[in-house]
């Protein structure tokens, strides 16, 4: 999806970044997580999205577009406040709910044009639409009360194109799905694969008996289980090969000496 124009570019384009690390190239690092992050692009003078692998990398990496802009674009906050004063509700606020094709379970928020309020919905993880926000506050700022928004509407870029199943928005999620915090599974820093691989086998709610495979994160192997045909979770594969392909690659041997916090 194409990013929207950034009105601050023409004013700030020729200026130097605030910090030397803002001039560094995006570095996704050697690990295999898929964490949506942002970096300052010296050539375009914009903050842009990239996929961070979850380890190493450099300082030109931010969790949010806003944080990137505040850190690397001189005078951004003043410009943002100025642009916000005349904000209108963007068109995508009026898009209908679209959970997307995939079957993740992600708590998201959308603007409901009938009730004129931001409401919670479940996003599946891929190919949805832009009326999809990670927080209630973000939804309200952009769609409910755009006039009072502390950031301009035209700053709504890839952070709001949450239509993809391959990127994530903060360190507690992978593929936009919150990773279950359980003492029985490897710690999240040790596992950089698809988060549903950490979920327990779930046979579902129906009455069928289908042979399926799930990834056991404790053993690092895929095991058979009976699936009843509906419900359940995404740790559910039709073949052992698909199970291993999807989940085995995420296990990382911890090479660091210190305790991971």
């Amino acid at each position: 999806l194409s990013e929207e124009a950034d009105d601050t570019d023409s004013e700030l384009g020729s200026m130097k970044p605030l910090h030397t690390f803002c001039a560094m190239k995006a570095d996704d690092g050697p690990c295999k997580a898929m964490i949506r992050s942002y970096f300052f692009n010296m050539y375009t003078h914009q903050c842009e999205e990239f996929i961070y692998g979850g380890c190493e990398g450099n300082e030109n990496r931010f969790d949010t577009l806003e944080e990137c802009k505040k850190t690397c674009i001189p005078g951004y906050e003043k410009t943002a406040v100025k642009a916000a004063s005349g904000a209108e509700r963007p068109d995508f606020c009026f898009l209908e709910e679209d959970p997307g094709l995939c079957r993740g379970y992600m708590k998201r928020y959308l603007y409901n044009n009938q009730t004129k309020q931001c409401e919670r919905f479940v996003y599946g993880g891929c190919l949805g639409n832009r009326n999809n926000f990670e927080t209630l506050d973000e939804c309200k700022k952009i769609c409910e009360n755009p006039v009072h928004s502390p950031s301009p509407v035209n700053e709504v870029q890839m952070s709001d194109y949450v239509t993809d199943g391959n990127t994530v928005t903060d360190r507690s999620t992978v593929n936009n799905i919150v990773v279950p915090q359980s003492p029985k599974v490897p710690r999240r820093r040790d596992y950089r694969g698809r988060p549903w691989c950490l979920q327990p086998a779930d046979s579902g709610l129906c009455k069928a008996s289908e042979r399926r495979f799930y990834y056991n994160s404790a053993t690092g192997k895929c095991h058979r289980f009976n699936y009843t045909g509906c419900g359940g979770n995404n740790n559910n594969f039709t073949t052992r090969r698909r199970c291993l392909r999807s989940c085995k690659t995420g296990l990382i041997k911890n090479k660091s000496k210190g305790v991971v916090k």
């Epitope: 995939c102 891929c126 190919l127 194109y161 239509t163 391959n166 039709t238 698909r242």
Partner: antibody, heavy 125, light 107 residues
């Protein structure tokens, strides 16, 4: 084995409505593990996704911006089929139209694994 | 939309040749890429999904690799039935988009 069988006219006049149907066998249009889409192909545009529908406790659709104001994709559960309607067509809409199934949803990858045979639709007076 | 650019747009090769087709995305799409083969008058046929997974029934001479923005489809030993047009497709972002195609012709 999933099969998709397309039907509909091959010639449509400008400003009229293009209507195509895709009959499904071997799967259900209201399956939780699939989605059903339309793609068209023309020499000028190549392969272009137009939209899809899917059922996840209720019906959802998603349409390409380029045709959003003119397109409707509807399911017909009684006949296990889905249809494409494209209003106000112009010669630019001349293309081979395909219906297809988004598969792989259970396993975390998605792809068009089954396609209809294609229908050449010519928009001409 | 994410633009998918394939190269070359066409190539001539002989039976037994190793053929490589590349696909470049205008943005990072991780490994969310599929490859299709299309023969004249037919619908596209899925070859590879998720960058490197071979679809059931597809010969093992087809393989895929890549990550991020650069992807490759390789045919290790071209067979007579492989002369066709090949398309990549990204599904990382909505809308899903296809490459313009690479035609593999007989030399």
């Amino acid at each position: 084995q999933v099969q998709l069988q397309q039907s509909g006219p091959g010639l449509v006049k400008p400003s009229q409505t293009l209507s195509l149907t895709c009959a499904i066998s071997g799967d259900s249009v209201s399956s939780n593990g699939a989605a059903w889409g339309w793609i068209r192909q023309s020499p000028g545009r190549g392969l272009e996704w137009l939209g899809h529908i899917y059922y996840r406790s209720k019906w959802y659709n998603s349409y390409a911006v380029s045709v959003k104001s003119r397109i409707t994709i509807n399911p017909d559960t009684s006949k296990n089929q889905f249809s494409l309607q494209l209003n106000s067509v112009t010669p630019e809409d001349t293309a081979v139209y395909y219906c297809a199934r988004w598969g792989g949803i259970h396993d975390g990858d998605i792809y068009f694994d089954y396609w209809g045979q294609g229908t050449l639709v010519t928009v001409s007076s | 939309d994410i633009q998918m650019t394939q190269s070359p747009s066409s190539l001539s090769a002989s039976v037994g040749d190793r053929v490589t087709i590349t696909c470049r995305a205008s943005q990072n799409i991780s490994n969310y890429l599929n490859w299709y083969q299309q023969k004249p008058g037919k619908a596209p046929k899925l070859l590879i999904y998720g960058t490197s997974s071979l679809q059931s029934g597809v010969p093992s001479r087809f393989s895929g690799s890549g990550s991020g923005t650069d992807f490759t489809l390789t045919i290790s030993s071209l067979q007579p039935e492989d002369f066709a047009v090949y398309y990549c497709q990204q599904y990382g972002n909505n809308p899903t988009t296809f490459g313009q195609g690479t035609k593999v012709e007989i030399k």
